[in-house]
Interface confidence: low
């Protein structure tokens, strides 16, 4: 007997037939290609079924014998046509063909659903040589079938550039239902109907669906897959799943939580990021969204001064990025700030109120009623003004800045004086005679220098002229005043 030759690395080599002059008379396999794992399958189908070759795809060889008799057509023998088995079971099936020994070069391959099974190490081909023909049995085994193994398998043999194809072997893997659509988690409005969908397939069919809510069956009668469950409405959170049943048993879908949308929880951790004289930048951490996305938020601001009228300013903003700059605030003022956010259900309660203060700013208006007159006896210019209204000082006055510009015969020079906060008058020395002096005054706080007043001009004559009358801030719309003395 010929010992079995193993070719581990090549699952699909060219299979040699017996060489002339060395024909074998016994029926031991001449060449056997290995089953990779050595696993003995749980389900086996016997190799060839005796009987006539089928007349499907046959090859009529062009070679004749010495007596010039034509050779019979080549064809695979009939074998089992349909195999039904359960998932995870093993299976082995085969095709066989007898090839006259004159053909010394044949290849055999397995195909599934029109695609060659490349590198399929669970294919094994055995040759049984005889005096005139060699029986070739190609076996294919799957150790643990899965649904993806379902399909139509065929053998193809190439011989002398002819192709011979076997009848198909249909593999049908049956198992527990397999979900193609499972219910999805949802957030729903209280007492509002919604649908859940469940779909599962076999084989075997049919697949029937039962719905389960909070561990209790919803429908007593099963529904054929696919199934849509209409829930008329919920008042509290529930967990739904579906059971898919077929002849092999049942599969349970994942449990999905159906949440009831509610108003959000109030924001937490409202904090001050930055303060200026007229704005406060706040941030907050959103509360639980109530299973519905935040739409927008409302910032409520009220003056913390007990003497204020208690009115609330409301600023609306988008829910993201949990940050808002509150503008148009008064300087050096205290405010209480709260944040509330809304989803489609409604507004949350207001967050805990926090206290915030604006900083000092530069005054927003200039000193009022600026008057300028010449005191010739002391060779000074006297300046008087009224301080800006308290509300518009935007801080505590620390003084004033006086700009005086002297212009004479094309020469111009600007001087700045700082004055303490107590006075509302100042005296500056005459710098140049026969010149125009232009005076502007600005109020100063720790927050900065405010705007300068409108310019007031006074003409300073040459020595010997008489002091006449003051110059003052013009009424709105008038030209700059010039007083010639």
């Amino acid at each position: 007997a010929i010992t079995e030759a193993r070719e581990e690395a090549k699952p699909y080599p060219l299979f040699p037939g017996p060489f002339p002059g060395s024909l074998q008379t016994d029926h031991t396999p001449l060449l056997s290609l290995p089953h990779a794992s050595g696993y003995q399958p749980a389900l086996m189908f016997s190799p060839t079924q005796p009987g006539r070759p089928h007349t499907g795809n046959v090859a009529i060889p062009q070679v004749t014998s010495v007596e010039s008799k034509p050779l019979p057509p080549l064809a695979f023998k009939h074998t089992v046509g349909h195999i039904i088995l359960s998932e995870h079971k093993g299976v082995k099936f085969n095709c066989s063909i007898s090839v006259p020994n004159i053909y010394q070069d044949t290849t055999i391959s397995w195909w599934k659903d029109g695609k060659e099974l490349l590198g399929a190490h669970h294919a094994i081909t055995q040759f049984y040589p005889d005096d005139e023909v060699t029986a070739i049995i190609a076996s294919f085994s799957i150790t643990s079938v899965q649904r993806s193994d379902n399909g139509s398998y065929i053998c193809k043999m190439k011989i002398n550039n002819e192709e011979i194809v076997s009848d198909p072997i249909y593999i049908e893997v049956q198992g527990l239902p397999h979900f193609t659509k499972q219910p999805e988690s949802m957030n729903v409005t209280r007492n509002t109907a919604f649908n859940l969908t469940c779909q599962a397939v076999g084989p075997p069919e049919p697949v029937n669906i039962f719905w389960v809510q909070n561990s209790s069956r919803v429908n007593e009668q099963p529904e054929k897959s696919p199934s849509v469950l209409t829930v008329p409405g919920l008042t509290e959170m529930a967990v739904f799943s579906c059971e898919a049943h077929n002849d092999k048993g049942l599969t349970v879908s994942k449990g999905v939580q159906i949440n009831i949308k509610a108003i959000p929880s109030p924001p937490t951790e409202v904090s001050i990021r930055n303060s200026t004289a007229h704005s406060i930048l706040i941030s907050w951490v959103p509360g639980f969204d109530g299973y519905s996305p935040f739409r927008n938020c409302s910032i409520q601001v009220k003056e913390a001064d007990p003497l204020s009228n208690g009115s609330v300013m409301i600023f609306n903003t988008s829910a993201l990025p949990h940050l808002y700059q509150i503008k148009q605030l008064q300087a050096l003022a205290n405010y209480s700030i709260g944040v509330s956010c809304m989803n489609e259900i409604g507004w949350s309660a207001v967050s805990p109120w926090i206290l915030a203060s604006t900083t000092e700013g530069a005054p927003s208006v200039a000193p009022l009623n600026v008057t300028v007159f010449l005191n010739e006896s002391s060779d000074n210019v006297d300046i008087r003004w009224m301080k800006p209204p308290t509300k518009q000082q935007d801080g505590e006055l620390v003084g004033y800045r006086i700009s005086h510009v002297w212009q004479s015969a094309g020469i111009s020079k600007e001087l700045l004086e700082e004055v303490g906060q107590n006075g509302s008058r100042a005296r500056i020395s005459v710098q140049v005679h026969n010149a125009t002096c232009t005076v502007r005054i600005a109020a100063v706080t720790r927050g900065g220098v405010g705007p300068f007043s409108d310019p007031v001009k006074i003409f300073i004559p040459a020595h010997g002229w008489v002091d006449y009358a003051p110059s003052s801030t013009p009424a709105p719309g008038n030209a700059d005043p010039v007083l010639i003395i």
């Epitope: 967990v239 449990g255 969204d289 299973y291 990025p321």
Partner: antibody, heavy 120, light 107 residues
Framework: QVQLVQSGSELKKPGASVKVSCKAS????????MNWVRQAPGQGLEWMGW????????TYAQGFTGRFVFSLDTSVSTAYLQISSLKAEDTAVYYC?????????????WGQGTLVTVSS | DIQMTQSPSSLSASVGDRVTITCKAS??????VAWYQQKPGKAPKRLIY???NRHTGVPSRFSGSGSGTEFTLTISNLQPEDFATYYC?????????FGGGTKVEIK
């Protein structure tokens, strides 16, 4: 304030089991899912899965099924990680980490970690 | 699974430097990225969630940006206490996946 306090270090032999606890305080335990994260010595962070502290339903990452079990005792606000048939490669620091927001999956608070050493 | 590729794996920097760490996701993860800081022998600490939101108490020198597949953590004015390992996490899809980490060392 929110705190996750884990049980102390464990030295185990291969094949043994270990149960790591993570006790939560400072918030409503059933409002936030609990994640488990592994960090092997000198390595990065690896997400093992999480457990829904409301329903008790666990979700395991690939590679953490079979020998790893997440469980809860809501009466004492504690999550557990049990590892059976310990192997040397299970040597790591195991962290519990709280889900930040009901609807999101990031973590906002972490336990201090439990070192599990598997050695013969 | 979604892979998070973090770079660089380590970097040296000085106090006061601006440091940038990036994470690339193998799929679109929208803005579902968080950043964590871990010091030796300690548990990770939260920094940023949803790509750009600072957790409460995290200094403003830490900022996050990005969406889709590219994300950045920036430390604008590196302080001595910032030398640590930083991890990104995608939380768009299960399984959640971390980046490999970036170790920030003193130059």
């Amino acid at each position: 304030q929110v705190q996750l306090v884990q049980s102390g270090s464990e030295l185990k032999k291969p094949g043994a089991s270990v149960k790591v606890s993570c006790k939560a305080s400072g918030y409503t335990f059933t409002n936030h899912g609990m994640n488990w994260v592994r960090q092997a010595p000198g390595q990065g962070l690896e997400w093992m899965g999480w457990i829904n502290t409301y329903t008790g339903e666990p979700t395991y990452a690939q590679g953490f099924t079979g020998r790893f079990v997440f469980s809860l005792d809501t009466s004492v606000s504690t999550a557990y990680l049990q590892i059976s048939s310990l192997k040397a490669e299970d040597t790591a620091v195991y962290y519990c980490a709280r889900k930040g927001v009901t609807a999101a999956r990031y973590f906002d608070y972490w336990g201090q970690g439990t070192l599990v050493t598997v050695s013969s | 699974d979604i892979q998070m590729t973090q770079s660089p794996s380590s970097l040296s920097a000085s106090v006061g430097d601006r440091v940038t760490i990036t994470c690339k996701a193998s799929q679109n993860v929208r803005t579902a990225v968080a950043w964590y800081q871990q010091k030796p022998g300690k548990a990770p600490k939260r920094l940023i969630y949803l790509a750009s939101n600072r957790h409460t108490g995290v200094p403003s020198r830490f900022s996050g940006s990005g969406s889709g597949t590219e994300f950045t953590l920036t430390i604008s004015n590196l302080q001595p206490e910032d030398f640590a390992t930083y991890y990104c996490l995608q939380h768009w899809n299960y399984p959640l996946t971390f980046g490999g980490g970036t170790k920030v060392e003193i130059k």
